[in-house]
Amino acid sequence: LQDPCSNCPAGTFCDNNRNQICSPCPPNSFSSAGGQRTCDICRQCKGVFRTRKECSSTSNAECDCTPGFHCLGAGCSMCEQDCKQGQELTKKGC
């Protein structure tokens, strides 16, 4: 028997509380693939992070760094301070 949840498109989740019908992702959440039983919470770009792309019903928010900082890690998981003019970046910092 086909799983009824497989019919739920990205941007929705299969709602067990409503007889496995597809429901829109709740506020501040998304699902990037179909057949999901929950939606994922949107990433918040706060502090030294700034929003490069808003969260949608089907894709997470993307962050970059505020001026004076640059991204490090997959998906800009960290922001590191830029070196001042005349300084160079080493493993220990500027």
Epitope: P9, C22, P26, P27, E54
Partner: antibody
């Protein structure tokens, strides 16, 4: 009886902020989302955003990102919509509407609307 | 983010049937069965007439029906009556960060 009662009309100067309230009664406040929709004079409906009164999570229309803030007070079953940096184009009737049911694709009950006029 | 496309006006005589279209894309109307229709009389708040493409809330006349084909949703009003004269708006869930989108509205005139 389900009711959404909104605050009264407001007149604001450009650059100011406005905070519209929407008091819910007749249902379990935290079980239903609240949408905010506006309508400029003689124009169509425009979706602004949605709030989950249970946890307070929000999603805003791209057009209003950075200018709109939706909050709620569960003790009084009231949702608030604050719009900042007002301009003349923000002159409109602002409606709150209950999402029906919990993760709903529609709004079954609407407030009476709050007229916000932005004028210098 | 542009609105869903509706005809500006549709008219019909009492007793006739009329259909209002609402055209979007595969990212909204075509991608989801979360299409609603609202009726709005002048100076009043909108009223939900159809939700989830074709479901009718209790209290809404059976003369109102909804359907969808591809990227276009439709609202049909059969047995047109004078009180049906109003503005009608479609609304759809979308994949964009603007999660819900309205059509531009259709003014229905009963001749």
């Amino acid at each position: 009886e389900v009711q959404l009662v909104q605050s009264g009309a407001e007149v604001k100067k450009p650059g100011a902020s406005v905070k519209v309230s929407c008091k819910a009664s007749g249902y379990t406040f935290t079980s239903y989302y609240t949408h905010w929709v506006r309508q400029a004079p003689g124009q169509g409906l425009e979706w602004m955003g949605i709030i989950n009164p249970s946890g307070g999570s929000t999603s805003y229309a791209q057009k209003f990102q950075g200018r709109v803030t939706m909050t709620r007070d569960t003790s009084t079953s009231t949702v608030y919509m604050e719009l900042s940096s007002l301009r003349s184009e923000d002159t409109a009737v602002y409606y709150c509407a209950r999402g029906a049911p919990e993760y709903s694709s529609s709004s079954d009950y609407w407030g009476q609307g709050t007229m916000v006029t932005v004028s210098s | 983010q542009s609105a869903l496309t509706q005809p500006a006006s549709v008219s019909g005589s009492p007793g006739q049937s009329i259909t209002i279209s609402c055209t979007g894309t595969s990212s909204d109307v075509g991608g989801y069965n979360f299409v609603s229709w609202y009726q709005q009389h002048p100076g009043k708040a909108p009223k939900l007439m159809i939700y989830d493409v074709s479901k009718r809330p209790s209290g809404v006349s059976t003369r109102f029906s909804g359907s969808k084909s591809g990227n276009t949703a439709s609202l049909t009003i059969s047995g047109l009556q004078a009180e049906d004269e109003a503005d009608y708006y479609c609304n759809s869930y979308t994949t964009s960060s603007t999660r819900w989108m309205f059509g531009g509205g259709t003014k229905v005139t009963v001749l």
